[in-house]
């Protein structure tokens, strides 16, 4: 029961996390204009991984995709790649984990197969979460670097007349969504891995078999009994083949050429 709950909760947490990673990747507010030094034009610029948006003083918002923009930073491409890898791995992980769920019966799937699938999906969720966290963190680092560079070169102009007031960018909502979503996916993955341990079939139990001598000779044949798991049909230590090994009720008093005294 606890295993099913852990697995189910891990799946739900990962599902929410991956939905968050997708949302963060699609969001436009990865970097937002720092309004500390609000320019006279009263515009608000925010940028995402795929497009840049500007809300003008009239309230009109215009967004443009970066496909027209040459020379995008390699770091931005790296962040895009990390987020996409995270989404793909997470999506595959979700697909695998659906079939691995203990509460869902698919044909005659063994518990060992479900355990393996749970572990696989768990590892995928962990890697997916790490990709998202890494992607968001790389972007955040890029923002911090850009912020201090912009602060140093904020005002540029000629002949005492300020000609440009450079925009400083700060953390956008997508960064926080990404961090939280990545964390949730990671936690979900860990929960799936924990659930996997409980799903795996128990190791072979060797049941003790007692031998009592009813006469002067003990009937014993090495290898006469199969090791029992406790789940099979040989739980009552019945005779497996004729050859000297007997259960307590079947021991005969006359010696055999195979007997060891």
């Amino acid at each position: 029961m606890a295993v099913t709950a852990c697995q189910g909760l891990g799946f739900v947490v990962s599902l929410i996390g991956i939905a968050g990673i997708i949302a963060a990747t699609c969001m436009d507010q990865w970097s937002t204009q720092d309004l500390y030094n609000n320019p006279v034009t009263a515009v608000f610029n925010y940028q995402g991984l795929w497009r840049s948006c500007v809300r003008e003083s009239s309230g009109f918002t215009e967004c443009r995709g970066y496909f027209t923009l040459l020379g995008l930073p390699a770091m931005l491409q790296a962040v895009r790649a990390l987020m996409i890898v995270g989404i793909v791995l997470g999506a595959i992980g979700l697909l695998v984990s659906i079939f691995a769920l203990k509460c869902i019966r698919i044909g005659s799937m063994e518990d060992s197969a479900k355990a393996n699938m749970t572990l696989t999906s768990g590892i995928m969720f962990i890697v997916s979460g790490l990709c998202a966290i890494a992607g968001v963190s790389v972007f955040a680092n890029m923002l911090v670097t850009n912020f201090w560079m912009s602060t140093a070169n904020m005002y540029t102009g000629m002949g005492g007349m300020v000609q440009t007031v450079q925009t400083r960018y700060t953390f956008g909502a997508a960064l926080f969504v990404g961090w939280v979503a990545g964390g949730l996916t990671l936690i979900g993955g860990v929960m799936m891995c924990i659930a996997c341990r409980g799903l795996a079939p128990e190791e072979t139990n060797y049941k003790a078999v007692s031998y009592h001598a009813s006469g002067h000779s003990v009937a014993y044949k090495p290898g006469g009994f199969k090791a029992s798991t406790g789940f099979g049909s040989n739980t009552k230590n019945k005779k497996i083949y004729d050859g000297g090994a007997r259960t307590e009720d079947e021991v005969q008093s006359y010696p055999s050429k195979h007997d060891y005294v």
Epitope: S58, L143, Y169
Partner: nanobody, 120 residues
Framework: AVQLVDSGGGLVQAGGSLRLSCAPS????????MGWYRQAPGKQRELVAS???????TYADSVKGRFIISRDIAKNTVYLQMQSLKPEDTAVYYC??????????????WGQGTQVTVSS
């Protein structure tokens, strides 16, 4: 580096007209909130007129009905058609716009200014 280049100023008689134009030099990604400001000697800089990409225009009360701001989106150029000019319109006229030049690169850009003198 991107710059806003404004032109069209000069000396004109009262009641006359002038047309100012402003465009960015260099490669830009997008341009927003283009407008004109003016600064008379010993006075604060004030907004004359501005236009946004959706066509919304704003005018200072003192120029309403006399000045018309227009924009050529294809050329990223803004114009200020000034008619019925008065001596109090004498000032240095500055073009202003918010320009996005690239990824995490934008700013509030100003032109170098063009002198408009209205003689009575």
């Amino acid at each position: 580096a991107v710059q806003l280049v404004d032109s069209g100023g000069g000396l004109v008689q009262a009641g006359g007209s002038l047309r100012l134009s402003c465009a960015p030099s260099g490669k830009i990604f997008s341009i927003h909130n283009m407008g004109w400001y003016r600064q008379a000697p010993g006075k604060q800089r004030e907004l004359v007129a501005s236009t946004t990409n959706d066509g919304t225009t704003t005018y200072a009360d003192s120029v309403k009905g006399r000045f018309i701001i227009s924009r050529d989106i294809a050329k990223n150029t803004v114009y200020l058609q000034m008619q019925s000019l008065k001596p109090e319109d004498t000032a240095v006229y500055y073009c202003n716009a918010f320009i996005v030049t690239g990824f995490m690169a934008s700013g509030d850009y100003w032109g170098q200014g063009t002198q408009v003198t209205v003689s009575s």
